[in-house]
């Protein structure tokens, strides 16, 4: 039975001429990830094979970079890059899991216009949250004087998008050469370089088992 879920960055937008990171994570399964394919419709963008490393399609070699993690960085974006992107996890024994990301590439002026309205809006939202949180803290402190209260700040909540697929919002993209992992330790890739190793790492916490910086490793997780 396939128990895993794919967490993705969901619907994203980027500016023409800029770059974007496409990210997926597989969680809630103990299946072994053998390969991850990145596709745009029927066009292959890249593959990361657990034994053989990265293969970037010749059609995209000049503007696709592997990583960070199992993700893919799309550079020099054009309006024609707008559309659906798929991450396909090949696993054993589960089979394949597919995640979907919709990318919209905006003209520079549109993106800037959007940003001008977004920044004050975000500021207002943040201020409102601060007021609400302060009120809650005061109320709780008054009612539970003797109990210590730990407030957990959760950045990048996962919200169910559809069966077997979730949206994932990374708080900040990790740089190439580092491990990208969500708290539940979904399957990921470490410090990859094109053509280098994506060898499976059975022990997620055994950081010392990385052979060298620049190797990329699949993680088997028990999320």
């Amino acid at each position: 039975m396939m128990t895993g879920t794919i967490e993705t960055t969901g619907n994203i937008s980027a500016e023409k001429g800029g770059s974007i990171i496409l990210q997926c994570h597989l969680s809630s399964t103990t299946a072994q990830v053998t390969q991850v394919n990145w596709e745009q419709q029927d066009q292959l963008l890249a593959i990361c094979n657990a034994d053989l490393g990265w293969h970037i399609s010749p059609s995209f070699k000049d503007r696709v970079a592997p990583g960070p993690g199992l993700g893919l960085t799309l550079q020099s974006l054009t309006v024609n890059d707008t559309g659906e992107y798929f991450c396909i996890y090949h696993t054993y024994p589960d089979g394949t899991y597919t995640g979907r990301i919709f990318l919209e590439v905006l003209e520079s002026s549109v993106a800037e216009h959007g940003a001008r309205f977004q920044i004050p809006l975000l500021g207002a939202m943040a201020a409102t949250l601060v007021v609400i949180c302060t009120a809650v803290i005061v109320v709780v402190a008054l009612t539970r004087k003797k109990k210590a209260l730990r407030i957990h700040s959760v950045e990048g909540d996962l919200r169910r998008k559809s069966a077997g697929q979730e949206e994932w919002s990374p708080s900040a993209p990790s740089p190439p050469g580092s491990c990208v992992q969500a708290e539940a330790a979904p399957a990921g890739l470490c410090g990859e370089q094109r053509g280098e190793d994506c060898a499976e790492l059975h022990d997620y916490f055994n950081v010392l088992s990385y052979r060298s910086l620049g190797n990329c490793s699949f993680f088997t997780e028990t999320g």
Epitope: Q43, L44, P58
Partner: antibody, heavy 120, light 107 residues
Framework: EVQLQESGPGLVKPSETLSLTCAVS????????WNWIRQPPGKGLEWIGY???????YYNPSLKSRVTISRDTSKNQFSLKLSSVTAADTAVYYC??????????????WGQGTTVTVSS | DIVMTQTPLSLSVTPGQPASISCRAS??????IAWYQQKPGQSPKLLIY???YRYTGVPDRFSGSGSGTDFTLKISRVEAEDVGVYYC?????????FGGGTKVEIK
Amino acid sequence: EVQLQESGPGLVKPSETLSLTCAVSGYSMTSDYWNWIRQPPGKGLEWIGYISYSGRTYYNPSLKSRVTISRDTSKNQFSLKLSSVTAADTAVYYCARGDYSNYGGAMYDWGQGTTVTVSS
Amino acid sequence: DIVMTQTPLSLSVTPGQPASISCRASQGVSTTIAWYQQKPGQSPKLLIYSASYRYTGVPDRFSGSGSGTDFTLKISRVEAEDVGVYYCQQYYSSPFTFGGGTKVEIK
């Protein structure tokens, strides 16, 4: 120029183990990946498996229980062992090189092949 | 495993005329297709990778196209030296699998 040369006994008895070696010259086996493929008489190609530059192996599930691919980097060669052979294993066996980074799973340097007959 | 089906099984072509070989995958394989030529008594040689990219030294009369499940190898003007068996291969997922082959003969 990279050259691959298969070698091994041309005749193997049923139930025995077929052993072949592929000698690689003009290139170090510490990069790329190295495949075995076979072709029964008058038939098509069947991919057996590979060994990667790091020594990791993958075998065709249809043969997995009987196949072992290993390498000797000091001699710049890799080997195929196929156990419990039957007449159905009679074929021309090829070794081939792949560069996953540039060509994915396409194999671009092939040996000339060696014929193995399984018969008592 | 992904099954690759080639058509036709054999093809007889007049020199200078075009030839077309089809390959169909049992499931979508994006553009992860290679084509090989095997001349009589020789080992296979890579012609095309990533569905449409000619390998080094391959004459430009050979071209590949397609994505998803349907792929085509075309020879724009067949020459006598093109006789042999042509195979498609997928590397979308392991195990890599080959088509059954198409035999090209000269009329």
